[in-house]
């Protein structure tokens, strides 16, 4: 049995089938009179009874909420209640990344030891009788693999397997075709004692900002404790005065390395914000690493169609 | 989030056999996740024991220094997973963790692949 969705805040990507199940399935079943309700609230909207008459995308089974696809607008919270047992979660929406096959907010990112196995199974348990081909991709290249079903990577870890795995399910409902992404960022280090820094998420950022507003760049880096995290821009750090350095949050890894995170805060954003090069650096004994933010005015953000899925 | 709960640490004789549960509280059914335990002793980086894929259990993962003495089980029923410790030794001290990585899809037996711990077990072997 596909178990029940009990995290409380649920953030998932526009256009994909997703499902809501309770935690009182087996006691449901029990109880098969007991009037069973799904509830939507958000904004100024107060609870209102969800039902397939409701949207044509969604529909109820037993225990399960299932949306086709879901959308934007079905961002908020979701109530199921049956007698007196209540469950609630907090949906969030957002935006698919159309210039990329994956979208960088739902990326699950992992660290393997070089050397050391891993293995990654394109598998979709709650869809799986739905499924009808699956592809991998690593940096949105597909890979040839013998299984179409659930292709597999099963092997010890080499440095040149480090990036970003996507799992993409396709399949078939009510005569549409969807598709299920599932990605992970597989960062490989040299060992526990001594790891090469990375800095997390794509050398090259395009922030989409509009003039007067404040946006904050985050850089995020796995690092060891000696190593420094900075941020650079301009012909020399301090001359805008709108920009300010955020202090440095660190937090200890399980295995006793460090995840920084430094935020450089931009306010009142004006055209000399435009168009240059905002760069955080990740140092260490071994070298270092950087990354790139631009920003680029909302309406000069070109929406280009389609998944970027390259074979 | 998960909250992971051990028991079942204790001193024991070298050569004997302890059993650690790693349980789940609230509505979190362990059988939708790789299991893994971890064992840190003093002055030590913390180790991979024995990990255990979800789906049925179908991929099962040692440590060279347990193979044949440790074995790692799921009962789905208690949602629990089990540690069973045989011919216990005394390089075998430490404090043991539990950790679950919900991950579907991606399976290891390296700390850095699990997302949520349990606050650990101290298991003792005296000579």
């Known amino acids: 049995a596909e178990s029940c969705t009990s995290r409380p805040h649920i953030t998932v990507v526009e256009g994909e089938p997703f499902y809501l199940k309770h935690c009182s399935c087996s006691l449901a079943h029990e109880i098969e009179t007991t009037t069973k309700s799904w509830y939507k609230s958000s904004g100024s909207q107060e609870h209102v009874e969800l039902n397939p008459r409701s949207s044509s995308r969604i529909a109820l089974h037993d225990c399960v909420l299932e949306f086709w696809p879901v959308e934007l607008n079905d961002t908020g919270s979701y109530f199921f209640q049956m007698k007196n047992y209540t469950q609630k979660w907090k949906l969030n929406v957002i935006r698919r990344n159309k210039h990329s096959c994956f979208t960088e907010r739902q990326v699950t990112s992992k660290i393997v030891e070089v050397k050391k196995f891993f293995q990654i199974t394109c598998e979709n348990s709650y869809y799986q009788t739905l499924v009808n081909s699956t592809s991998l991709y690593k940096n949105c290249k597909k890979l040839l693999l013998e299984n179409n079903k659930n292709p597999t990577i099963k092997k010890n870890a080499e440095f040149e397997d480090q990036g970003y795995y996507s799992c993409v399910h396709f399949l078939h409902h009510n005569g549409k075709l969807f598709n299920i992404t599932k990605t992970f960022n597989i960062t490989i280090v040299e060992d526990r004692s001594n790891i090469v820094p990375v800095l997390l998420g794509p050398k090259l950022n395009h922030v989409a900002v509009e003039l007067g507003k404040n946006v904050r760049l985050n850089c995020s880096a796995l690092l060891n404790e000696e190593d420094v995290i900075y941020w650079m821009f301009g012909e020399e750090n301090g001359s805008d005065p709108n920009i300010h350095e955020e202090k440095e949050m660190r937090i200890m890894t399980p295995e006793g390395k460090w995840h920084a995170s430094k935020v450089l805060r931009i306010e009142n954003i004006g055209e000399s914000n435009l168009n240059v090069l905002y760069n955080c650096t990740v140092a260490s004994t071994g070298g270092t690493d950087t990354k790139s933010f631009i920003l680029v005015r909302k309406a000069d953000m070109a929406d280009i169609p389609g998944h970027v899925f390259t074979r | 989030d998960v909250q992971l709960q051990e028991s079942g640490g204790g001193l024991v004789q070298a050569g004997g056999s302890l059993r650690l549960s790693c349980a789940a509280s609230g509505f979190t059914l362990l059988d939708s996740y790789d299991i893994g335990w971890f064992r840190q002793a003093p002055g030590k980086k913390r180790e991979e024991v024995s990990c255990i894929s979800s789906s049925g259990g179908k991929s099962t993962y040692y440590a060279d220094s347990v193979k044949g003495r440790f074995t790692i089980s799921r009962d789905n029923a208690n949602n629990t997973v089990y540690l069973q410790m045989n011919s216990l030794k005394p390089e075998d001290t430490a404090v043991y963790y539990c950790?679950?990585?919900?991950?579907?899809?991606?399976?290891?037996?390296?700390?850095?692949?699990?997302?949520?711990w349990g606050q650990g077990t101290q298991v003792t072997v005296s000579s």
């Open positions: 950790a679950a990585d919900g991950a579907e899809g991606f399976w290891s037996c390296q700390s850095g692949g699990y997302d949520y």
